[in-house]
């Protein structure tokens, strides 16, 4: 059951009156409460990235951020299921991988993420509006689909070469990351509430700004483990339209798995695939507090003024959102 913390809209105090500290003391418990209540929601991510080396090639990777075990992944392009999408590949953890032209190589990167390489079909560059979708069937969460497309501002000349990052199972990353953050957060929340009882609440001055001034809000990343899940890239050469758009793909029974060897999945087994890579230390709460300072009127040094709707060209390791929350 998905539950959300109902957080009242707080009016931010005037920066010069009560100061940022009073604001932070009031908002931080709500932030932590939202973290505590919303952390268990499964999330699907899709990454599409143009390669710097070849104008006609780009990268697609998909991952599932949840604690369940994945039973099937379907990759399509042209739109999601039911909206004209064409299936490119189906990956099963035990029965192997099935792919259709122009897909050349679909593979498991971790136990919860996959990558796909498509054959180029002569087009000089991919369309900016090509949509790739990944559908993850997992137990016990159910079926979840997400789509992504090439960022319109992608400039292959500016994109830095990808760097290897830790390969972690999403559930382990969740256990390590979310549990630690939540444990600390909930303890800190209790500590704050306790301290709050022992002293009078600071008086909030009514805001003198316009009625449309932004409210203070408690925000929280759906998964604290997102940052740990980036893995090396695979290349896709493709054109705007699938070469097999009018080809009917079999979706009926599992009979077509029969010819596939079980090792075809290339799915990493055991801890060897991820244990050797250190987990990056990230100051999640420092970022959260920076965000709170920014809302209170004090901009942290690394917080830029530009807020973008669609992607930040710095890549998936760029800070998630304008406030530096990961």
């Amino acid at each position: 059951m998905r539950t959300e913390a109902q957080v009242p809209a707080l009016q931010p105090p005037e920066p010069g009156l009560e100061g940022a500290m009073g604001h932070r003391t009031l908002v931080l418990p709500w932030v932590l409460l939202t973290l505590c209540v919303t952390a268990g929601t499964p999330e699907v991510w899709v990454q599409v990235r143009m390669e710097a080396t070849e104008l006609s090639s780009f990268t697609i990777r998909c991952g599932f951020l949840g604690s369940g075990s994945i039973s099937l992944v379907t990759v399509s392009w042209g739109g999601p299921n039911g909206a004209g999408g064409t299936t490119l590949a189906v990956l099963h953890p035990e029965r192997g991988i099935r792919q259709w032209a122009p897909a050349r190589q679909a593979r498991w990167e971790t136990q919860s993420s996959i990558s796909l390489i498509l054959e180029g079909s002569g087009a000089s560059s991919p369309c900016a509006n090509t949509t790739f979708c990944c559908k993850f069937a997992s137990f016990p969460e159910g079926s979840w689909e997400a789509c992504g497309s090439l960022p319109p501002s992608s400039d292959p000349g500016l994109s830095a070469p990808p760097t290897p990052a830790p390969i972690l199972r999403a559930d382990l990353a969740g256990i390590l990351g979310v549990s630690g953050v939540l444990l600390f957060g909930c303890v800190y929340l209790l500590h704050l509430l306790r301290r709050h009882k022992h002293r009078p609440a600071p008086r909030l001055q009514p805001s003198r700004t316009s009625p449309q001034a932004p409210r203070a809000r408690a925000w929280a990343p759906s998964q604290a483990s997102q940052a740990a899940l980036h893995v090396p890239y695979a290349t896709i050469n493709t054109s705007c339209r699938p070469a097999t758009l009018d080809t009917a793909h079999p979706h009926g029974g599992p009979s077509w798995w029969a010819s596939l060897p079980t090792h075809a999945a290339h799915r990493p087994q055991g801890p060897a695939a991820w244990a050797s890579t250190p987990i990056p230390a990230r100051g999640s709460f420092v970022s959260v507090e920076n965000g709170l300072y920014a809302q209170a009127g004090e901009r942290p040094p690394h917080t830029g003024p530009g807020l973008t709707l669609f992607p930040d060209p710095r890549g998936p390791r760029a800070m998630e959102g304008p406030l530096g929350v990961r």
Epitope: Q6, V7, T38, V44, Q47, V48, A146, P151, R215, G306
Partner: nanobody, 125 residues
Framework: QLQLVESGGGLVQSGGSLRLSCAAS????????MGWFRQAPGKEREFVGR??????????SYADFVKGRFTLYGNQARNTVYLQMNSLKPEDTAVYSC????????????????WGQGTQVTVSS
Amino acid sequence: QLQLVESGGGLVQSGGSLRLSCAASGRTRSMYVMGWFRQAPGKEREFVGRIKWSGDTTYTSYADFVKGRFTLYGNQARNTVYLQMNSLKPEDTAVYSCAASKFPVSGVPEHYDYWGQGTQVTVSS
């Protein structure tokens, strides 16, 4: 100021499909997360799903009742977000609204800064 306009609603038979669109115009640079919510007659506004962008990666999450029936995705070139709804049920009847925020918010309506007017979806049995 940011404007959000929804479209694509209508009357559909149970088991059918609809695709809702939410087009953003104006200060689209002030958006970071876009969410869909719905409100059935006499009920509270309910979170459906949200999509957020970071670089070349799109993160999507949904409410539990979605159960794989709905897909949220965006056309980045056109500043448009879609909600593809399959296997619709009569209980999906509601006004569907899209919302945007400049902060990485969760599914709480109060956290969103900008709202569209909503589009009516009616599922008949």
